[in-house]
């Protein structure tokens, strides 16, 4: 094949080569730029900065060489457009420091930066770090910084991250009322910050307020959607990303459902409470005190992270035309009560009715959680005749 | 499988407590089943001395309620009998076992009360 | 009252049926359990709530309930079936379980 006189040339299928000296000063409009996965860059003394325009249109690409050229400067957010990025090698040029910024969010297994006359500041922590930590193959290249020896002796006592303190009202908010936060930001060579608040939806207007150090925001006429939502305070500096979430408890008052009895591996009276707080629970039968044993208990479903409802069973396990009756659930909660009731019928005496026997009712439940539970059955038997009756 | 394992003291005075734990393996004891503890007295039958559920409920056997308390530990998947107050009568093999159909037992351990 | 009674012996020639029996107020109103148990071994469960059978349990075992009396009917006994076997049930209050005093079956 006749060799290639363009400053870039294919290589193999979805490669390609620019080594011709001094042939680029950037990186726009190179051929074939969408389905590259391979970008080999050599002697290009004029290309000196790397920035998100340049890798615009190059999704596809998983290594990225730069060498002995003339790169003094990678943006931050450079690999915006590359996600797929595994392989990036970037030695010897003029780089003298590398934002932590600029490899967030990739999943590098293989950073080369030797023969770059690195800084050492609390910029490079980062990069110190991933030498401890054994990441990217950077041990490997005991990393030098230019005139001040090696990066791993780089001091770093006093390279940390923001810190961050959110501030909360202590006393109990109502829905609708307003609530102000505030997060103190300290730390040095603070950039950036700001809220995170994509859990809020509909919970509470939102204004915010005031900049670094102490950041406002201010939840107005809040609903108790609120609660278990995540309101996330955050700041950024040359040395990485800080992150504080809190939650507002907005106080409402208990709320109770019940739902037909259902018959599963044993039957199931469902139910959901709601409430904040989270409301105690009490069980009657026939309106008298429900005391739980391993035969009749409540048991609650995993709960949801993000929400204050609460759905359950009573479980009965095997239960007989004693557990016949009506079924009240009560929550109560500082904010206020509530109860539902139902009829459940489980089945017929199948013991043979006599109007002299005593009927047994099962006489304080704390409530209760969780999953598994019967023996594993060699045959499975269909019940007495059953019917549900709905109070 | 479920696996159950009592473990204490085999010798225990008159008039002490006799402190019993059983260690569950192969499920967790916070799952919904309940923990029992059963007792057997030599070459007689078996009596129940009480349940418990991960959340705290307990309930016991009238005739030794006030002498029994039923804990469990759910960082280390156990649950625990004490009994106070122990004479010779409390002399037996004791299990453990899953309720409510005590479908899963220990292997039991004797705990001869003695001075 | 809060008690299970069995009959303390029975025997069976191997091969026959043979029924256990347990006797109690509450079992008019809940179902027993029944547990075989050989010498110097934990109980074993072979039958709970309304004939149920625990895996590995032989389908010779079967059990049933009328007024105030539940039954443990073993179809066939087998040599190995020789054992103690007790009733238990949750007592008339329903707040606690109560045993039986056993019925020792001997395979004849």
């Known amino acids: 094949a006749a060799p290639c006189p363009d400053a870039c040339c294919p290589h193999g299928s979805s490669g390609l080569r620019c080594t011709r000296d001094g042939a680029l000063d950037s990186l726009h409009h190179l051929p074939g730029a969408e389905n590259l996965t391979e970008l080999y860059i050599e002697n290009q003394q004029h290309l000196q900065h790397l920035e998100l325009r340049d890798l615009r249109g190059l999704g596809e690409l998983r290594n990225l060489t730069i060498v002995k050229s003339g790169l003094r400067f990678v943006a931050p957010d450079a690999f915006h457009f590359t996600p797929r990025l595994s392989r990036l090698n970037l030695s010897f040029n003029a780089l003298e420091s590398l934002s932590w910024k600029t490899v967030q969010g990739l999943s590098l297994q293989e950073l080369v930066l030797s023969g770059n006359p690195l800084h050492c500041s609390c910029a490079l922590r980062w990069l110190q770090r991933w030498e401890e930590e054994g990441l990217g193959g950077v041990p490997e290249q005991k990393l030098q910084c230019h005139g001040q020896g090696p990066l791993a002796h780089m001091p770093n006592a006093s390279c940390g991250v923001p810190t961050l303190k959110v501030q909360v009202p202590n006393a109990s908010v109502d829905v609708g009322d307003d609530v102000l936060l505030r997060c103190q930001v300290e730390g040095r060579g603070l950039e950036q910050a700001g809220w995170i608040l994509t859990e809020l939806e509909q919970s509470a207007t939102v204004m915010k307020s005031g900049g670094l150090p102490s950041l406002g925001l201010t939840l107005a006429n809040v609903t108790s959607d609120l609660n278990r939502k995540n309101v996330t305070c955050w700041a950024e500096n040359d040395v990485g990303r800080a992150e504080v979430s809190v939650q507002v408890n907005v106080s409402f008052p208990a709320s109770v459902q019940l739902h037909t009895a259902v018959e599963m591996h044993h039957w199931c009276i469902p139910f959901s409470v709601d409430g904040q707080p989270a409301p105690s629970l009490r069980w009657l039968f026939n309106g008298s005190v429900l005391n739980e044993t391993s035969f009749i208990f409540t048991e609650f479903l995993e709960p949801a992270a993000n929400e204050t409802v609460r759905h359950g069973c009573l479980r009965l396990n095997q239960p007989t035309h004693v557990n016949n009756g009506n079924y009240t659930l009560l929550a109560a909660n500082p904010f206020g009560q509530a109860s539902a009731s139902i009829m459940a019928a489980f089945m017929d005496n199948p013991f043979e009715f006599n109007p002299e026997d005593p009927i047994p009712v099962s006489f304080s439940p704390v409530d209760t959680n969780s999953t598994s539970g019967d023996p594993v059955e060699k045959k499975d038997e269909t019940p007495f005749g059953v019917s549900v009756a709905v109070g | 499988e479920v696996q159950l394992q009592e473990s204490g003291p085999g010798l225990v005075k008159p008039s002490g407590t006799l402190s019993l734990t059983c260690a569950v393996s192969g499920g967790s004891i916070s799952s919904s089943n309940w923990w029992t503890w059963v007792r057997q007295p030599p070459g007689k039958g078996l009596e129940w001395i009480g349940e418990?559920?991960?959340?705290?409920?307990?309930n016991y056997n009238p005739s030794l309620k006030s002498r029994v308390t039923i804990s469990v530990d759910k960082s280390k998947n156990q649950f625990s009998l004490k009994l106070s107050s122990v004479t010779a009568a409390d002399t037996a093999v004791y299990y453990c076992a899953r309720a409510p159909w005590f479908d899963y037992w220990g292997q039991g351990t004797l705990v001869t009360v003695s001075s | 009252s809060s008690e299970l009674t069995q009959d303390p012996a029975v025997s069976v020639a191997l091969g026959q049926t043979v029924r256990i029996t347990c006797q109690g107020l509450s079992l008019r109103s809940y179902y027993a359990s029944w547990y075989q148990q050989k010498p110097g071994q934990a109980p074993v469960l072979v039958i709970y709530g309304k004939n149920k059978r625990p895996s590995g349990i032989p389908d010779r075992f079967s059990g049933s309930s009328s007024g105030n009396t539940a039954s443990l009917t073993i179809t066939g006994a087998q040599a190995e079936d020789e054992a103690d076997y007790y009733c238990n049930s949750q007592a008339s209050s329903g707040n606690h379980l109560i045993f039986g005093g056993g019925t020792k079956l001997t395979v004849l």
């Open positions: 418990i559920y991960h959340r705290g409920n307990r």
